[in-house]
C-alpha cells in the first residue's frame, strides 16, 4: 500500500496511457482520478515527488522527481491539468514498455551510485492503461529491472516489498485484465488492479490503497468510502451524556482534540455533577470512557448577569473533558484540528511561519464563511452546512438573538452576544440548518483542503426548531445559533492542553 | 560464471598488517553480502565478518575475535572485496576464504580458492 | 553469539549406508518462517561447498541423496546412501544472527 508517512520519503510516477484505443473522455477521466489522488495523499501532509508521464508510440515526460517542484502538489496538478489527449495524436500506438523504461530511468541515479537515502525512499507507480500494448515488447520486464534497481524480492530477511506498489488502473472502452494483472504488485490482502468503475467512487479506490498508519494522529482527518461508518467521516466527533438522579439525563456532543481530552460546551455540566456520572463515547463504541475532570472555562458563569435580567448568560461556554485512560487513535477515532496549531498550520498547508491572525485570516475572513456541525438524526450523524455569518450580515445575525427567550428585555445585545461568538442561521445567503438541544457542545467545523478544522463550540440558540429531536421543516428566519469562536478562548485552550504535543503556534 | 579470487597472502611477522583482496566476477557484486572465513591448520571454519549489500550502505560486520583489529572494505567499481589485517598474531595462521553471501537465503553459495596467511617470526 | 554444536564428531560409514548429522544451537536460529541453518561439505585441500540452505533446501547441482531438515534449535544433515565421494567434513552454518557461526564440524570417514 502507499504508506502515507509525513517522515518518511516517496516518489509517485503517474503513468497515462494516452493511445488511440483509450480515447478522449476516458483519458479526462483517469486525469480526473490522478488529480483526485494527488489532492488525497497531500491531505495528509506528505510531500511525495511525482514522477508525471503520458505515453503512445513514446512516452513525454511532463514532470521529473527531480525536478525542484515535483514535490509541489498543487504545481503537478496544474501541469496534469494542462496534458491533453491530442499530445499523442500523431503516434498513437501504445509502447507501455517505454513508458516504463522512462520511469525507471527517474529512478536510477548516475554512475551507479545510489544518492544517500535511496533505500528509505518508496516507490508508487500508477499506471493507466488498457494493457493494449502493440509494439517495443513486453512492459514486465522493465518492471522486473526496477525491483532489481530498488532490491526488492532479493533479501530473504529484508524482502523491502513495501518499497515498491504497482498500481494498475484498466481505462478504456476494452481492458486486457491478462496484461493489466500481470504489471500490477501481487501482495496478501491488497488490490492493486482497478476497473473503470471503480473510479466512480475513488474514496473507495483510496481507501484500497492507502495505508495510513502511520499517521493516525493527524487531525482532521476523515474517510468517506461507501463501507465507512458515521465515525469514519466524523472521527472526532463524541457524545456526552449526563446522567443526573431524579432529573433524567442531559446530552450533549463534543470533539476530540487530543488523546486524553474532549471539548464541548460548558453549559452541559452543573457543579454538582459527578465525574462518574457524565458518560463519553467516541468512535461509535458502545463503551463508555472514564472521565478524570471536567475543566470549565474560568469566565464561564450562567448566571453571571441573573441581576442584569438575562436568566442565561453563555460567554465563554466551552469545557474540557479530561479522560482517565489515552484514547487509541483509528480510522474512526481521531482528533479534529484547532485554531493556531502546528497541525492546523500543516492541514491548510501554510508556510511553517504561519501566524495566528494569518491562520484567523484563512478560516474566519470577514465574509459568509461555508461551515459544518453534525447532529444526529434517527441515531446517524450528519453533517449540516452552515454559513458563519462574519462579515456584512454578522450584526443582524446577532441582533437576532433578542429573539431568544429571556432576552426579549435585552438593550444592547451585546450585554448577551458578546465577541467570543459565531453566528449562523436564518436564510441568507442559504436556509441554514439550526442546531438541536443535543448538539450542543459539538465543533463548528471549517473543511478545507480536505481537512475538518473546529472553529467553533455550539453553544446555543434563538428558536428550538427541534421537537423530539425532529428539526421542522418551516423554521423563522430569524432562528439563529451561537457558537464559541475558538479564537478567542485560546489562552485557556493552550494552557489547559500545554502537554497534548498540539503545537500552539 | 561466478568466479572469486583472493591474493594478498604470505608471510608476516607478529605485530605486522596485511591486506588481503578478493577479486570477483559473474554477479552483481554490490547487490551481495561479502564474507571472509579463515581456518587454521587443521582447524574448523571461522567466520570473520562481511560488508553488507547495497540496501545497507556495504556496512561491515566482525566476529569479536578480530574486531577493532581486521577491516573489512570493498570496492565496488573494481568488484573486489579486501580485508585489512593489523596487529597480527600467530594465531591469525590460516588459510583466508572470501565468499559470496547469498541475500536471498543468507548462505555463502560461492568461495574463492583461499589464501595463506602465516603469522610468524 | 549463537554457539554451535555438531555430533557426532566422527562417523564411520560404509558406502552404500544412510549418514545422519546433528547439529545443535544454543538458541533458536528461526526468524520469520524461516530457518537460518545451512550445511557445507569440505574436502582436504579444498574450499567449503554449500550443500543445504534454510534448513532444508537443496543447493542446485548438489545431489538429491543428500537432505536437511529441522528448524529451531535442533537440524540435521541425511545423507541417504552415501557415494565414495561423499567422505569428507561437514559443517553447520547459522545465519540468523551476526556474529555467524559455524559448528566445529562432523567428519564423516570411511569404516
Known amino acids: 500500500k502507499i504508506v502515507l508517512d509525513p517522515s518518511g520519503s516517496m516518489n509517485i510516477y503517474l503513468v497515462l496511457d494516452g493511445s488511440d484505443s483509450i480515447g478522449a473522455s476516458n483519458f479526462t477521466g483517469a486525469k480526473k482520478c490522478l488529480v483526485n489522488l494527488i489532492e488525497k495523499v497531500a491531505s495528509y501532509g506528505v510531500k511525495p515527488r511525482y514522477g508525471l508521464v503520458t505515453y503512445a508510440t513514446y512516452p513525454k515526460i511532463w514532470v521529473k522527481v527531480s525536478e525542484a517542484d515535483s514535490s509541489n502538489a498543487d504545481w503537478v496538478t496544474k501541469q496534469l491539468n494542462e496534458i491533453n489527449y491530442e499530445d499523442h495524436k500523431l503516434k498513437s500506438g501504445t509502447n507501455t514498455k517505454k513508458a516504463l523504461q522512462a520511469v525507471y530511468s527517474m529512478m536510477s541515479w548516475p554512475d551507479d551510485v545510489p544518492p544517500e537515502g535511496w533505500n528509505r525512499t518508496r516507490h508508487v507507480i500508477i499506471l493507466m492503461t488498457d494493457g493494449l500494448h502493440n509494439m517495443g515488447g513486453d512492459p514486465i520486464t522493465v518492471i522486473d529491472e526496477i525491483r532489481d534497481l530498488l532490491y526488492i524480492g532479493k533479501d530473504r530477511k529484508n524482502p523491502r516489498e513495501d518499497y515498491l506498489d504497482v498500481y494498475v488502473f484498466g481505462v478504456g472502452p476494452l481492458v486486457n485484465q491478462v496484461n493489466i494483472n500481470a504489471l500490477a504488485s501481487k501482495k496478501d490482502n491488497e488490490q492493486h488492479v482497478f476497473k473503470v468503475k471503480d473510479m466512480e467512487n475513488l474514496e473507495d479506490v483510496f481507501y484500497q490503497m492507502i495505508d495510513e498508519s502511520q499517521s493516525l494522529s493527524l487531525c482532521g482527518m476523515v474517510w468517506e468510502h461507501r463501507k465507512g461508518t458515521d465515525y469514519h467521516k466524523q472521527p472526532w466527533q463524541a457524545k456526552i451524556s449526563v446522567i443526573r438522579p431524579s432529573k433524567g439525563h442531559e446530552s450533549c456532543m463534543g470533539a476530540v482534540v487530543s488523546e486524553y481530552f474532549v471539548l464541548t460546551a460548558a453549559h452541559c455540566f452543573t457543579v454538582d455533577d459527578k465525574e462518574h456520572s457524565i458518560k463519553v463515547s467516541v468512535g461509535g463504541e458502545k463503551r463508555d470512557l472514564e472521565i478524570e475532570v471536567v475543566l470549565f472555562h474560568p469566565n464561564y458563569n450562567i448566571n453571571g448577569k441573573k441581576e442584569a435580567g438575562i436568566p442565561e448568560f453563555y460567554d465563554y461556554d466551552v469545557a474540557l473533558i479530561k479522560l482517565k485512560n489515552k484514547l487509541k487513535y483509528g480510522q474512526t477515532i481521531r482528533p479534529i484540528c484547532l485554531p493556531c496549531t502546528e497541525g492546523t498550520t500543516r492541514a491548510l498547508r501554510l508556510p511553517p511561519t504561519t501566524t495566528c491572525q494569518q491562520q484567523k485570516e484563512e478560516l474566519l475572513p470577514a465574509q459568509d464563511i461555508k461551515a459544518l456541525f453534525v447532529s444526529e438524526e434517527e441515531k446517524k450523524l450528519t453533517r449540516k452546512e452552515v454559513y458563519i455569518k462574519n462579515g456584512d450580515k454578522k450584526g443582524s445575525c446577532e441582533r437576532d438573538a433578542q429573539y431568544a427567550p429571556g432576552y426579549d428585555k435585552v438593550k444592547d445585545i451585546s450585554e448577551v452576544v458578546t465577541p467570543r461568538f459565531l453566528c449562523t442561521g436564518g436564510v441568507s445567503p442559504y436556509a441554514d440548518p439550526n442546531t438541536c438541544r443535543g448538539d450542543s457542545g459539538g465543533p463548528l467545523i471549517v473543511h478545507k483542503r480536505s481537512r475538518f478544522i473546529q472553529v467553533g463550540v455550539i453553544s446555543w440558540g434563538v428558536v428550538d426548531v427541534c421537537k423530539n429531536q425532529k428539526r421542522q421543516k418551516q423554521v423563522p428566519a430569524h432562528a439563529r445559533d451561537f457558537h464559541i469562536n475558538l479564537f478567542q478562548v485560546l489562552p485557556w485552550l493552550k494552557e489547559k492542553l500545554q502537554d497534548e504535543d498540539l503545537g500552539f503556534l | 560464471e561466478v568466479q572469486l579470487v583472493e591474493s594478498g597472502g604470505g608471510l608476516v611477522q607478529p605485530g605486522g598488517s596485511l591486506r588481503l583482496s578478493c577479486a570477483t566476477s559473474?554477479?552483481?557484486?554490490?547487490?551481495?553480502?561479502m564474507s571472509w572465513v579463515r581456518q587454521a591448520p587443521g582447524k574448523g571454519l571461522e567466520w570473520l565478518g562481511f560488508?553488507?549489500?547495497?540496501?545497507?550502505?556495504?556496512?561491515?560486520e566482525y566476529a569479536a575475535s578480530v574486531k577493532g583489529r581486521f577491516t573489512i572494505s570493498r570496492d565496488n567499481s573494481k568488484n573486489t572485496l579486501y580485508l585489512q589485517m593489523n596487529s597480527l598474531k600467530t594465531e591469525d595462521t590460516a588459510v583466508y576464504y572470501c565468499a559470496r553471501d547469498n541475500p536471498g537465503y543468507y548462505a555463502m553459495d560461492y568461495w574463492g580458492q583461499g589464501t595463506l596467511v602465516t603469522v610468524s617470526s | 553469539e549463537i554457539v554451535l554444536t555438531q555430533s557426532p564428531a566422527t562417523l564411520s560409514l560404509s558406502p552404500g549406508e544412510r549418514a545422519t548429522l546433528g547439529c545443535k544451537a544454543s538458541?533458536?536460529?528461526?526468524?520469520?518462517?524461516?530457518?537460518?541453518m545451512n550445511w557445507y561439505q569440505q574436502k582436504p585441500g579444498q574450499a567449503p561447498r554449500l550443500l543445504i540452505y534454510a534448513a532444508s533446501n537443496l543447493e542446485s547441482g548438489i545431489p538429491a541423496r543428500f537432505s536437511g531438515s529441522g528448524s529451531g534449535t535442533d537440524f540435521t544433515l541425511t545423507i541417504s546412501s552415501l557415494e565414495p565421494e561423499d567422505f569428507a567434513v561437514y559443517y553447520c552454518q547459522q545465519s540468523n544472527a551476526d556474529p555467524y557461526t559455524f559448528g566445529q564440524g562432523t567428519k564423516l570417514e570411511i569404516k
Open positions: 538458541q533458536s536460529v528461526d526468524y520469520d518462517g524461516d530457518s537460518y
Open positions: 559473474g554477479f552483481t557484486f554490490r547487490d551481495y553480502y
Open positions: 560488508s553488507r549489500h547495497r540496501v545497507y550502505g556495504y556496512t561491515p
